[in-house]
């Protein structure tokens, strides 16, 4: 029996498919067994990561260090790759056993923590085919998928989801906002064999839909009919001048007239000052430009809408989601202010496993991370207040000294003498 028949064991499944006229393709059928974990990296073995990750050979590129940062939920578990030099490009990648996602779900997941209060920098990953030369990975290296947060100035705070389709990087048509705080966040991309996708942040869905609808992979289904053009007699004017309306005879009056109340000053000298002219004022009878009354246009046909036809260039593609070969995960980034930590990378075919993995990593340490940060912030506030108090005290002391210096010198007498003096005077 064929492999498909074996897969469809059980009473009459093929008959059910036939009866319900369900269309299916062999490559789009996938039956979940054990989750396939293609790549997982948690940086739990100290410097072990350096043998698994390859850096681009370029001296002026930034260095990644292993760190859990200034605050964390668990110092060991939260160790990840941290960018460590400002205003640098970064290029680091890890390879794995090549696989294809044809006929199955693809899940890409990782955590990002911008603890430096990032101003401009990438937090995204790129998935490459295994043909990538890892020692020469750069911005123009062809990738399959790019996914993750990106922040640059006030204008860019988004999650990129870019697919390379037939050699072209195609950007999502939606705006997915990323997190821009200092805490660790979990980013998940799910791409399914039915050409649908889902983006999750912190294990909550923030966007989903169809690949065909939300990216411009294919030409549009409809186009304007190139043979159609607006008929010459098509009238798009909703209103026209009333042909029966005419300008009243007394309409035309000058806009300005000489001020009838103005008088020539008594000391006006025509020889010296020239001929006196009264100042002009706005004419109260001026009516402006006459315009005929507007009436409904009896020939009005509405706005001409260019008719559409089926686009002969369009043909559906059921395998937009599919790639023959994934083999490398890369961080190809620019960061103005460094400090971002990447951790808990996962590439799998199992959505539930990815969610569980997220909950066991990010989920377990997020509360403690926030606690530590809050404690640090509180300590910092206290220190700041103490510093302010000290500064104020110093300023007061300085002011007192200055006052003493400025005031006229008096003979120094002890309190006892002064009091006695006052007593005897009294």
């Amino acid at each position: 029996s064929s492999s498909l028949e074996v897969l469809f064991q059980g009473p009459g499944l093929n008959d059910i498919f036939e009866a319900q006229k369900i269309e299916w393709h062999e490559e789009n059928l996938y039956f979940q067994g054990e989750p396939a974990v293609y790549f997982k990296e948690q940086f739990l073995d100290g410097d072990g990561w350096t043998s698994r990750w390859i850096e681009k050979h370029k001296s002026d590129f930034g260095k990644f260090v292993l760190s859990s940062g200034k605050f964390y939920g668990d110092e060991e578990k939260d160790k990840g790759l941290q960018t460590s030099q400002d205003a640098r490009f970064y290029a680091l990648s890890a390879s794995f056993e090549p696989f294809s996602n044809k006929g199955q779900t693809l899940v890409v997941q990782f955590t990002v923590k911008h603890e430096q209060n990032i101003d401009c920098g990438g937090g995204y990953v790129k998935l490459f085919p295994n043909s990538l030369d890892q020692t020469d990975m750069h911005g123009d290296s062809e990738y399959n998928i790019m996914f993750g947060p990106d922040i640059c100035g006030p204008g860019t705070k988004k999650v990129h989801v870019i697919f390379n389709y037939k050699g072209k990087n195609v950007l999502i048509n939606k705006d997915i906002r990323c997190k821009d705080d200092e805490f660790t966040h979990l980013y998940t991309l799910i791409v399914r064999p039915d050409n649908t996708y889902e983006v999750k942040i912190d294990n909550s869905q923030v966007e989903s839909g169809s690949l065909e609808d939300d990216w411009d992979f294919l030409p549009p289904k409809k186009i304007k009919d190139p043979d159609a053009s607006k008929p010459e007699d098509w009238d798009e004017r909703a209103k026209i001048d009333d042909p029966t309306d005419s300008k009243p005879e007394d309409w035309d009056k000058p806009e300005h007239i000489p001020d009838p109340d103005a008088k020539k000053p008594e000391d006006w000298d025509e020889e010296m000052d020239g001929e006196w002219e009264p100042p002009v004022i706005q004419n109260p009878e001026y009516k402006g430009e006459w315009k005929p009354r507007q009436i409904d246009n009896p020939d009005y046909k509405g706005t001409w809408i260019h008719p559409e036809i089926d686009n002969p260039e369009y043909s559906p593609d059921p395998s937009i989601y599919a790639y023959d070969n994934f083999g490398v995960l890369g961080l190809d980034l620019w960061q103005v202010k460094s400090g971002t930590i990447f951790d808990n990378f996962l590439i799998t075919n199992d959505e539930a496993y990815a969610e569980e993995f997220g909950n066991e990593t990010w989920g377990v340490t997020k509360a403690a991370e926030k606690q530590m940060k809050d404690k640090q912030d509180e300590e910092q506030r206290t220190r700041r207040m103490m510093r302010t108090k000290m500064r104020m005290r110093r300023m007061r002391r300085t002011r007192r000294k200055m006052r003493r210096k400025m005031s006229p010198a008096r003979p120094r007498t002890s309190c006892r003498e002064a009091c006695l003096q006052g007593w005897t005077e009294a």
């Epitope: 205003a87 911005g139 123009d140 640059c152 006030p154 860019t156 072209k168 549009p220 980034l333 620019w334």
Partner: antibody
Framework: EVQLVQSGAEVKKPGASVKVSCKAS????????ISWVRQAPGQGLEWMGG????????NYAQKFQGRVTITADESTSTAYMELSSLRSEDTAVYYC????????????????????WGQGTTVTVSS | SYELTQPPSVSVAPGKTARVTCGGN??????VHWYQQKPGQSPVLVIY???KRPSGIPERFSGSNSGNTATLTISGTQAMDEADYYC?????????FGGGTKLTVLG
Amino acid sequence: EVQLVQSGAEVKKPGASVKVSCKASGGTFSSYAISWVRQAPGQGLEWMGGIIPIFGTANYAQKFQGRVTITADESTSTAYMELSSLRSEDTAVYYCASSPLRGSGWYWHYYYGMDVWGQGTTVTVSS
Amino acid sequence: SYELTQPPSVSVAPGKTARVTCGGNNIRAKHVHWYQQKPGQSPVLVIYQDSKRPSGIPERFSGSNSGNTATLTISGTQAMDEADYYCQAWDSSTVVFGGGTKLTVLG
């Protein structure tokens, strides 16, 4: 939206250098890539190079490599293009144009085209 | 180096559809942008990413890109559309422009 205002016309002798400025206003200078494009009389558009001010890195067309220097001063939101060893063929209108970055990678402006252009600066090279 | 080829001129009757083409090897893998330039003026972006219209550009401008040809289409062409049109793409971190097409609106 950003506006780009360029410096005035220049007349130069062959062998000299010219430096054209392009001041941006009404937008965040760091959110754009600035390209320099020239157009000789009656000819088409020719890209010379570009810079992303926030990165401070410039890249140049092969043809102008070594002869053109593009810089940016973030404090004044101004980009500059300096062309040296001028010859009569360099007589042209020089435009600066901006592309929105919409991301932190230097390749983001590939995707959006040059959506704002300066008014152009005429450079005449004549002995 | 990558080259983009445009016809030097295209003529169209008012109200009809004008098509300006831009040829390049496997151009469909590039993001193509189109600029309009009227005499004595700076260029204006009319289409980006093959088919997207910047705000303020009339709906009659559209674009497509497949195979080795990208196309700018102007439906219901008006006299004011008479101008030079340039296609542009990126290749290996370099901007490439087509040679330009002069669109003449007849009559």
